[in-house]
């Protein structure tokens, strides 16, 4: 059957955890992405900013994960009102921000 | 001000009952989860259990699950402790914790009472 | 259950930096709190949600949390820093809250 939405925002936290402990090298070679607002929709916002990062093994699972949190389908090029169009981070930052709100998320129980 | 204050520790044989109480004053109580925390003499703190902001779900630690009962009465802003089956290792101070209410019980401890005494000896 | 390891002291001059560690497996999946117990005393919270630090709390007081291992940074060292220091996390699998071993803050 389906992943519980509490189970599903659980195994894509312990995912971020993964891939930000395992480099040993600049995740995805420090490439940049737009940052987004950590509002509602964030999970289609984060997917659209990470879905333009190219050639990167270390955050596929996490795109793929992202996408079923995501209503709509995402291509690469596509973007939101919720990204800070002037605000580039790298990666990794990226994911460290983004991995402490999903944590406070999964804490409040928002599990979709 | 916001404060907890506890009372009810003493000193217990070993197979008795003891019932702790903490007061709570200066904010809205049934807001809040609850908890109670301990520390045997020279040792580090213990997790005890926890109570809902409305009393709707306990969870305790496996030490005392089936001896300890946290309660708590938001009409009055009290939290209470009822201890059966008491051992020699339960002796500590026991602290009454509040932390905000989410979800989960994940969290901080944002205001701790002094703590009262328990001793279980025979 | 899940065990939270701290080692049991640290020692700093001070003026320096202390550095007390948590570790856990996967760690950095969970919302890790920071106490700080002097003697006699109630513990007091000094950092929240991996890194946040209470209002009350000076800037000096820092924390991080990635992979397996919290840490919890003291800048610039004062005496009155010494004092046990635990750190928190909630074990959402067991519906548990566990603390570590506390760590023993001496300032030389």
């Known amino acids: 059957g389906p992943v519980p939405p509490s189970t599903a925002l659980r195994e894509l936290i312990e995912e971020l955890v993964n891939i930000t402990q395992n480099q040993k090298a600049p995740l995805c070679n420090g490439s940049m992405v737009w940052s987004i607002n950590l509002t509602a929709g964030m999970y289609c916002a984060a997917l659209e900013s990470l879905i333009n990062v190219s050639g990167c093994s270390a955050i596929e699972k996490t795109q793929r994960m992202l996408s079923g949190f995501c209503p709509h389908k995402v291509s690469a090029g596509q973007f939101s009102s919720l990204h800070v169009r002037d605000t580039k981070i790298e990666v990794a930052q990226f994911v460290k921000d983004l991995l402490l709100h999903l944590k406070k998320l999964f804490r409040e129980g928002q599990f979709n | 001000q916001m404060q907890l204050v506890e009372s009810g520790g003493g000193v217990v044989q070993p197979g008795r009952s003891l019932t702790l109480s903490c007061a709570a004053s200066g904010f809205e109580f049934r807001t809040y989860g609850m908890h109670w925390v301990r520390q045997a003499p020279g040792k580090g703190l213990e997790w005890v259990a926890v109570?809902?902001?409305?009393?709707?779900?306990?969870h305790y630690a496996d030490s005392v699950k089936g001896r300890f009962t946290i309660t708590r009465d938001n009409s009055k802003n009290t939290l209470n402790l009822q201890m059966n089956s008491l051992r020699v290792e339960d002796t500590a101070v026991y602290y009454c914790?509040?932390?905000?209410?989410?979800?989960?019980?994940?969290?901080?401890?944002?205001?701790w009472g002094q703590g009262t005494m328990v001793t279980v000896s025979s | 259950s899940y065990i939270l390891t701290q080692p049991p002291s640290v020692s700093v001059a001070p003026g320096e930096t202390a550095t007390i560690t948590c570790g856990g497996n996967l760690i950095g999946a969970k919302l890790v709190h920071w106490y700080q117990q002097k003697p006699g005393q109630a513990p007091v919270l000094v950092i929240y949600d991996d890194s946040d630090r209470p209002s009350r709390i000076p800037e000096r007081f820092s924390g991080s949390n990635s992979g397996n291992t919290a840490t919890l940074t003291i800048s610039d060292v004062e005496e009155g820093d010494e004092a046990d220091y635990y750190c928190?996390?909630?074990?959402?699998?067991?519906?548990?809250?566990?603390f570590g071993g506390g760590t023993k803050l001496t300032v030389l």
């Open positions: 914790v509040r932390a905000p209410q989410w979800y989960l019980t994940a969290e901080a401890f944002d205001l």
């Open positions: 109570i809902w902001d409305d009393g709707s779900n306990t």
């Open positions: 928190q996390v909630w074990d959402y699998y067991a519906d548990t809250m566990v």
